[in-house]
């Protein structure tokens, strides 16, 4: 039994880091493998993660972490019974994938303006809380070409757009994702999408 693709890990910078790797053949990850992880920290203790299958030869493990600070460094040991298959380390602050924003809502009752709001996925005491920026994706269910991205570079989790920038009388969907420049993170997953019917009053033409 050998590791074909070494574990790579990303952290949500809160409580979970996710590590993925591939074995050289079909493996029952949860029965055959264990990933031990330990904070490099005087008198810390090792924790065991039981991996799950992620495709035939792929494994994934969700490492539970008690908060994250920038100095954190973990040792990782991948075991198959008594055999050490791989040894490595992981610094969560250097491999951050933020949590996805939630509770995306489209408010259509503001005069001819669409107000999109969502929730910051972090609590106020987390470092990322004040460092997230967002991308909002809006697309038409009827017209695949009608697809747009709005970059929200301010901290407030909201976006205002004129309803007239979208076509009237058709349904749209929106979703939002986040990233943090300070840790050069990857983008989060997209939030669940929300749907609304776009309608607005066309301005009267003057003759």
């Amino acid at each position: 039994m050998k590791v074909l693709q070494e574990p790579t890990c990303v952290s949500d910078y809160m409580s979970i880091s996710t590590c993925e790797w591939k074995m050289n053949g079909p493996t029952n990850c949860s029965t055959e493998l264990r990933l031990l992880y330990q904070l490099v920290f005087l008198l810390s203790e090792a924790h065991t993660c039981i991996p799950e299958n992620n495709g035939g030869a792929g494994c994934v493990c969700h490492l539970l972490m008690d908060d994250v600070v920038s100095a954190d460094n973990y040792t990782l040991d991948l075991w198959a019974g008594q055999q050490l298959l791989w040894k490595g380390s992981f610094k969560p602050s250097e491999h951050v994938k933020p949590r996805a924003p939630g509770n995306l809502t489209v408010h259509t009752n503001v005069s001819d303006t669409l107000l999109l709001t969502w929730s910051n996925p972090y609590p106020p005491d987390n470092y990322l809380y004040n460092h997230l920026t967002y991308a909002v994706n809006i697309w038409s269910e009827n017209d695949p070409a009608d697809f747009r991205i709005y970059n929200v570079t301010y901290l407030e989790p909201s976006l205002r757009i004129a309803a007239s920038t979208l076509k009237s009388g058709i349904s749209y969907r929106a979703r939002v994702r986040a990233w943090a420049q300070c840790y050069n993170t990857t983008w989060s997953e997209w939030s669940p999408s929300t749907k609304w019917h776009n309608s607005y009053r066309e301005p009267f033409e003057q003759h």
Epitope: L39, F41, L42, L43, E45, V69, D72, N73
Partner: antibody, heavy 120, light 108 residues
Framework: EVQLLESGGGLVQPGGSLRLSCAAS????????MHWVRQAPGKGLEYVSG????????YYANSVKGRFTISRDNPKNTLFLQMSSLRAEDTAVYYC?????????????WGQGTTVTVSS | EIVLTQSPGTLSLSPGERATLSCRAS???????LAWYQQKPGQAPRLLIY???RRATGIPDRFSGSGSGTDFTLTISRLEPEDFAVYYC?????????FGQGTKLEIK
Amino acid sequence: EVQLLESGGGLVQPGGSLRLSCAASGFTLSSYAMHWVRQAPGKGLEYVSGISPTSGSTYYANSVKGRFTISRDNPKNTLFLQMSSLRAEDTAVYYCVRVKVRYRGGMDVWGQGTTVTVSS
Amino acid sequence: EIVLTQSPGTLSLSPGERATLSCRASQSVSSAYLAWYQQKPGQAPRLLIYGTSRRATGIPDRFSGSGSGTDFTLTISRLEPEDFAVYYCQLYGASSVTFGQGTKLEIK
């Protein structure tokens, strides 16, 4: 209420021995790394020793290595420091402290201290 | 072994003023954790800041920590009468624990 209560301090002659105890209440000792920190009269804080939550791994400052032994009795929720070959420079208030991994080495709970005096 | 040096040894200020206490490590400590404690006469120390910049439970927001590498700072934005005490920095690393020698913050 979370509390640590040290006992066992006193006056001892150079070369003598003493055993300090620390009774924990309001939390489970086995969930935390536990440490001893001391403070000589009019001086600053000095780290002495620590022990991991369950594996029993220990660490000692160079100044006490080979003379002091830290141990714990998790079922009794008690931490110990066995001190031998005591020297005048070991005279101090000894504090029992808790370290929460979440606090990354920050010692969030301290006992009131027990005084050890090494003198002839 | 890493040595922590605190400065100044004594800081004389008045209530309402801003206090800046320094802690310098003898070598870079990128994978270690810096904490700050307050100690009043006859009392055990109290944890103020851990992980360089995070306030411990119940600590007022006038206390803040910052720094990286070798230089760390504890700032008290607006001194209250109860803040006059001795302050210690502490480094908790992979293989050692070290305290600074302390800074005494006294009323001017």
